[in-house]
């Protein structure tokens, strides 16, 4: 049969609230060298136990009896500390355990989860979470909105999750946890009501360097909108935007619009250029979320200046004219040049030269026409740019280089008939 247990004092019981500090103690009387005392919790050896062992000899001889006291300190009681505690010793070839002591947790409810501050769009549903535990159980929750209970009694309304169908003003929420020991109140969460995201961002009109855009504001609760902010970003390499990247790849052009009206003219843009635009509206509570990026494009414009460095020389019945691309912005894709020449008493001749920057003209009458002048204009798909000032044909002097060009015979009647709007900026000479 088993030897008698050496334990003369067993661990007591501890029951308290979270954070409590307590000590479990066991005592044994042994003959000979005192053993090391181990502590078990629910059958498991506590490897990092905060324990102290005191040994007192009862006689002069080492082989006399010893009193051994082991104390286990629980510094801040948590749920994980609860359970059955025993002392364990190995004596010779036998194992002894003390009678068990119990550590229990009992106090005010303890929050595992509390409502968090957040922002929500006006009139938009959201959920808040709150979770508490004892012991003792059960723990019943009571939600409060702006310090007003949302149910008649704890446990009667929503529990772990509160569904709010929408708010029109910034509000505070908290939850109370009730158990047999009393009530604990959670932190107070502030739910800030922001304007809803604007809708239906669209183009009203387009000019080569400006776009007029409009949108429909979202609801903003009891807080009027103070302004809306529009951002535009060049999107020639803006792959990130199309892929739904939240931030543009470069610094956006930002404009503020007073509201109403929910409309804004964006100026100083590049012609014939793709942009992405988005809008957010702000109330005293803060800004709405941005709309999705909307791809837009400025239209082409006409060139803003005439071709440069026009020179025109004449040698008998031939005239050689050449020029350079306008220095002024083209505002689109250059499609070509138009050339007009005219003598003192002869009708104007209009020609489309295409993208070449030089032409040799075959003049009629072997140069008998006097005071011949030439004008050149660049054009895009949007129309003609301004015509150059008339350039008189100079007589060719020997020694001047005369490039060989494809000859263009002067037609007897103008080769082209122009729609009227192409003539409006032609300054006649």
């Amino acid at each position: 049969q088993a030897e008698e247990s050496p334990f003369v004092g067993n661990p007591g019981n501890i029951t308290g609230a979270r954070g409590l500090t307590g000590t479990l103690r066991c005592q044994l009387q042994v003959q000979g060298e005192p053993p090391e005392v181990h502590w078990l919790r629910d059958g498991q050896i506590l490897e990092l136990a905060d324990s102290t062992q005191t040994q007192v000899p009862l006689g002069e001889d080492e082989q006399d009896d010893w009193i051994v006291v082991s104390q286990l300190r629980i510094t801040s009681l948590q749920l994980s500390d609860t359970g059955q505690y025993q002392c364990l010793v190995f004596l010779g070839h036998q194992t002894f355990v003390s009678q068990p002591g119990y550590v229990g947790l009992e106090g005010l409810p303890y929050f595992l989860e509390e409502p968090e501050d957040r922002t929500v769009a006006a009139n938009t549903p959201f959920n808040l979470s709150c979770q508490a535990q004892g012991p003792p159980e059960p723990v019943d929750l009571l939600w409060l909105q702006d310090a007003v209970p949302l149910a008649t009694a704890p446990g009667h309304g929503p529990q772990r999750s509160l569904h709010v169908p929408g708010l029109n003003k910034t509000s505070s929420f908290s939850c109370e946890a009730h158990n047999a020991k009393g009530v604990t109140t959670s932190r107070t969460a502030t739910i800030t009501v922001l304007p809803q995201q604007p809708r239906n961002l669209h183009l009203v009109s387009r000019q080569p360097t400006e776009l007029e855009v409009a949108w429909t504001p979202g609801l903003s609760g009891i807080y009027p909108l103070t302004h809306c902010t529009l951002q535009a970003v060049l999107s020639d390499d803006g792959m990130g935007i199309q892929a739904g990247e939240p931030d543009p790849p470069e610094e956006p052009l930002t404009s503020q619009a007073s509201v109403p009206p929910h409309q804004l003219r964006l100026g100083s843009l590049h012609p014939h250029t793709p942009y992405h635009i988005r809008v957010a509206c702000t109330s005293s509570q803060g800004p709405s979320s941005w709309t999705h990026w909307l791809p837009v494009e400025t239209p082409e414009g006409v060139p803003l200046g005439p071709p440069e460095n026009i020179s025109a020389t004449r040698n008998g019945s031939q005239a050689f004219v050449h020029w350079q691309e306008p220095r002024a912005p083209l505002q689109g894709t250059l499609l070509g040049y138009r050339l007009a020449y005219q003598g003192q008493d002869t009708p104007e001749v209009l020609m489309d030269i295409g993208l070449r920057q030089e032409v040799t003209l075959e003049l009629q009458g072997d140069g008998s026409v006097s005071n011949l002048t030439v004008c050149v204009a660049a054009y895009t798909a949007a129309g003609d740019g301004p015509w150059s000032l008339p350039v008189p044909l100079e007589a060719w002097r020997p020694g001047q280089a005369q490039p060989v060009h494809q000859l263009v015979k002067e037609p007897s009647t103008p080769a082209f008939s122009w729609p009227h709007h192409h003539h409006h900026h032609h300054h006649h000479h």
Epitope: Q1, A2, Q44, T95
Partner: antibody, heavy 116, light 106 residues
């Protein structure tokens, strides 16, 4: 000396339950935990749970929760393990083992065969 | 749960040889325990609290280690040591065992 003696082999059909007993002697039965560990043919050891005979408190491995029940009868120093809804992969030798933070004494094992 | 991995899985050795079995834990543990299981027998405790010899275990067996790496050493192997050896931890629940190392005597 400490001894743990288990009940004999069992053959069960899938879906049935089996109850294995473990009789302790040679030490104060109510002071030490009784654990149950199983070993499938040619396999390693798997802990199923424990019972503290002094109080009847139990702790089960999550894997077996809902299917295992451990009980004891202190008057005859015997612990029991019942496993329900048996499946063919429950075929194993089931051991009871006394524990003091580890398994210092083992029963001889009970072979449970689950076969249709 | 903590996973224990033993090495080697199998070893064939001659008597009088020194044998080392290692056990690696997936997380740091405080103590390791070792068991011996012979064919058709139940496991038997060899080493407790990492390095303490259980009652009746020959002194040729020893244990050591800390953290995640533990070792069982058999100093001068005898024929009766042919068995499967298991390491075990109970630093965290559930207690787990290594997959076993089978020792064969040549």
């Amino acid at each position: 000396q400490v001894q743990l003696v288990q009940s004999g082999a069992e053959v069960k059909k899938p879906g049935a339950s089996v109850k294995v007993s473990c009789k302790a002697s040679g030490y104060p039965f109510t002071d030490f935990y009784i654990n149950w560990v199983r070993q499938a043919p040619g396999q390693g050891l798997e802990w199923m749970g424990w019972i503290y005979p002094g109080s009847g408190n139990t702790k089960y491995n999550e894997k077996f929760k809902g299917r295992v029940t451990m009980t004891r009868d202190t008057s005859i120093s015997t612990a029991y393990m019942e496993l329900s809804r048996l499946r063919s992969d429950d075929t194993a030798v089931y051991y009871c083992a006394r524990s003091t933070g580890f398994f210092d004494y083992w029963g001889q094992g009970t072979l449970v065969t689950v076969s249709s | 749960e903590i996973v224990l991995t033993q090495s080697p899985d199998f070893q064939s050795v001659t008597p009088k040889e020194k044998v080392t079995i290692t056990c690696s834990a997936s997380s740091s543990i405080g103590y390791m325990y070792w068991y011996q299981q012979k064919p058709d027998q139940s496991p038997k405790l060899l080493i407790y609290l990492t390095s303490n010899l259980a009652s009746g275990v020959p002194s040729r067996f020893s244990g050591s280690g800390s953290g995640t790496d533990y070792t069982l050493t058999i100093n001068s192997l005898e024929a009766e040591d042919a068995a499967t050896y298991y390491c075990q931890q109970w630093s965290s629940n559930p207690p787990t065992f290594g997959q076993g190392t089978k020792l064969e005597i040549k």
